[in-house]
Interface confidence: low
């Protein structure tokens, strides 16, 4: 009405769907008597009387609010229960005396939407599409008012970008008055989006403030052409014979092309296709030096029939050839000299070492080992090791046996063996020499002889302990073309005092073999008190 003062802004009352709204009539005593008030709802500028207060007593008017209104706070407040979205409107109270005044209340209604449901485009998106394609659809059900949708890619909000990103939102009103929101994210994706995580977020307000609910994260299949194929070799680094080597073809396209791996024939220089496993991997196990060469991968896009070739990759399977030692079977007289030479080929620089076989002692670093003034102890095994220092584990070895001419040499000269009468005694006797000696025993028994190495022999005798044997003892004799030598085993009966040896002796029932190299003594299955070894 012209000339009438502008109405003050209505008081704002905020409430969630389903709860009770308390509409407090803000008329002062001067503006009207609260014991005589009419309440109206205003919808589309039409007032509807919904409640009367007379002498402090309330009475609902027939209609949509009839069952949900009641008076509180000594008549000053109207309670509206089970609030619905349709209740979002202005309510006003009007006092009747002394003059008609009104107080307006704006009721705002809120309802948090359900958790957003996101569905990714299962068909995927090609990167070369001419316009934005559907990436995913987000649905937020039963919210009020309409929630705001924000789309995220990798945790960052996506904003409208002309011809690149488009967010298409629509909403439907349910019979409850709540909104269901559907938002479609359309985008032109690039290859880098293949791992991108997309999700939608519903922003909504409640009386308590702003809130948000997030959907799960999804990735969309992104299809992009292969631009590059390449070979990958495992393990990375220097390869050696015996390794398990895998050569695989990789591409930067999705889906990947059909792969084939070829190796250049060194003779014809033609590429020859290799047989790969079901996964398209060429497995070389064990790798050999013949596997060295130039490999390349071909990727064939079965849709476009476009073929791409990788950069060729040189594969080097490092090797060490068989090691050759000269002379191969050296024989020398005592006092003479010997030069042993080691040779091998490799794809890398070699390092040579000479080791004494029996002790593992390094004698020489280099391919040539010189031995002077040879003693009979110098006889035995010498090992040449050819190794590639830059590739751990890549080495080959060759053992050569040096023979020193000489008569038999006994592991021990004489030995005491503790026995019990009528037991079967297991005796052993070892000798070395060149030519390799044979061993004989001075008593009857079951003897067996085994060659330990080209210059060494071990003989074992099983014999019954008799009084005569205790009397005579046992002798073993080793013979070759250059002479003979004998070891004596004295047999002594075990008694209680011998079972308590002093600090200078040891006892044992184990069987062991005495040899010039191990410095062990003659053995018996009975306890023995060994003596210091003597060499014949």
């Amino acid at each position: 009405v012209p000339g009438e003062a502008e109405q003050p802004a209505p008081e704002l009352v905020e409430v969630e769907v389903g709860s009770t709204a308390l509409l407090k009539c803000g008329l002062s005593q001067s503006q009207g008597n609260l014991s005589h008030v009419d309440w109206f709802s205003v919808h589309k500028e039409k007032r509807t009387l919904i409640f009367r207060v007379r002498q402090g007593q309330g009475q609902s008017e027939p209609g949509e609010y009839e069952q949900r209104l009641s008076l509180q706070d000594r008549g000053a407040t109207l309670a509206l229960t089970q609030v619905t979205p349709q209740d979002e409107r202005i309510f006003l109270c009007q006092g009747k005396r002394p003059r008609s005044q009104e107080y307006r209340i704006q009721l705002r209604v809120y309802k948090a939407p359900e958790e957003p449901n996101i569905q990714v485009n299962p068909l995927g998106i090609p990167v070369n599409s001419k316009e934005p394609e559907e990436v995913a659809t987000c649905v937020g059900r039963n919210g009020y008012p309409i929630p705001q949708v924000i789309w995220y890619k990798n945790g960052r909000p996506l904003k409208e970008e002309k011809n690149r990103v488009h967010i298409q939102s629509s909403q439907t009103v349910e019979s409850s008055g709540l909104y269901t929101l559907q938002s479609i994210l359309k985008a032109q994706l690039v290859k880098e989006d293949k791992d991108a995580q997309f999700y939608c977020e519903l922003n909504y307000r409640l009386p308590s403030g702003n809130h948000m609910k997030e959907s799960r994260e999804v990735t969309v299949p992104v299809f992009y052409p292969t631009e590059k194929v390449w070979l990958e070799v495992e393990p990375v680094g220097m390869l050696k014979e015996g390794d398990r080597v895998e050569i695989r073809c990789l591409a930067d396209g999705n889906p990947p092309p059909h792969f084939s791996i070829s190796k250049q024939n060194p003779s014809t220089r033609e590429a020859e296709e290799e047989t790969t496993n079901d996964n398209g991997v060429l497995v070389l196990e064990p790798a050999r030096k013949e596997h060295s060469g130039r490999y390349e991968c071909q990727g064939l896009d079965l849709d476009t029939m476009i073929s791409l070739l990788s950069e060729p990759q040189e594969l080097l399977v490092n090797y060490v050839s068989d090691v050759r030692v000269s002379p191969a079977a050296p024989e020398r007289q005592e006092g003479s000299s010997l030069t042993l030479t080691c040779e091998a080929e490799s794809s890398q620089d070699l390092e040579f070492q000479w080791l004494r076989e029996e002790t593992g002692q390094v004698l020489e670093r280099g391919p040539v080992l010189q031995l002077h003034d040879l003693k009979r102890e110098a006889g035995g095994g010498y090992r040449c090791v050819a190794s590639v220092p830059s590739i751990p584990g890549l080495n080959r070895t060759q053992l050569v046996n040096v023979a020193i001419f000489g008569p038999p040499w006994m592991a021990f000269k004489e030995r005491k063996v503790w026995v019990k009468e009528n037991m079967v005694l297991n005796l052993s006797c070892e000798a070395s020499g060149h030519p390799r000696p044979t061993i004989s025993w001075n008593v009857n028994g079951t003897a067996s002889e085994q060659d330990q190495d080209p210059q060494r022999v071990l003989s074992t005798l099983n014999v019954l302990v008799t009084p005569e044997l205790l009397e005579t003892g046992v002798e073993c004799t080793a013979s070759n073309d250059l002479g003979k030598n004998t070891s004596i085993l004295f047999l002594e009966l075990v008694n209680l005092t011998t079972l308590t040896p002093d600090s200078n002796t040891t006892t044992g029932l184990s069987t062991s073999t005495a040899s010039p190299h191990t410095r062990a003594n003659s053995t018996s299955t009975e306890r023995k008190l060994p003596e210091p070894e003597s060499r014949g």
């Epitope: 995220y152 409208e160 002309k162 690149r164 922003n203 702003n210 948000m212």
Partner: antibody, heavy 119, light 106 residues
Framework: QLQLQESGPRLVQPSGTLSLTCVVS?????????WSWVRQPPGEGLEWIGE???????TYKPSLKSRVSMTVDTSKNQFSLNLTSVTAADTAVYYC????????????WGQGTLVTVSS | YELTQPPSVSVSPGQTASITCSGD??????ASWYQQKPGQSPVLVIY???KRPSGIPERFSGSNSGNTATLTISGTQAMDEADYYC??????????FGTGTKLTVL
Amino acid sequence: QLQLQESGPRLVQPSGTLSLTCVVSGASITTPNWWSWVRQPPGEGLEWIGEVYHSGSTTYKPSLKSRVSMTVDTSKNQFSLNLTSVTAADTAVYYCAREAVGAADFDYWGQGTLVTVSS
Amino acid sequence: YELTQPPSVSVSPGQTASITCSGDKLGDKYASWYQQKPGQSPVLVIYQDSKRPSGIPERFSGSNSGNTATLTISGTQAMDEADYYCQAWDSSTLYVFGTGTKLTVL
């Protein structure tokens, strides 16, 4: 080299409207960047006001939302800020800035212009 | 949403300066750092927690986890004396700047 240059009245009356323009040179305003306004009252810290996209989409700081509007003019390669109902509390150096693509930070800034609200 | 910084930090030349920025679950957001010298515009020195724009010396580094982001300047130089602001973003708070820290190189 991308450059941003703010321009507009340096003195605004209380309850009036502050209007600033940022001219972008060295790059197109239609690149996938958001263009922001940030202010700094004398001797105080930085405060983000809002941002605008070349499509016209905007985001404003909630506490300023009722007073702010931003627009883009792609033909002139520039964007603008309007702040209504200003008070002395709006006195500040106003910067325009570019948000880096794919990151929530500002990689290019204008040199800033001091706007004083006073009668 | 608020980001709190110490008002001032002092450091001797050649030493390491650390400026912190605290905010509720700040580690869940990207933090950026700006250097501002008197009378000049801010300059981005760290973005996305720890990345350095081209042209920014390697002595500037950043980290962000939990409720705290940290800007570290190793081998601080006199030219590093300036105000430093952290900044974070998320969907509900949008852009928020820290209160600012004055770095003094003694």
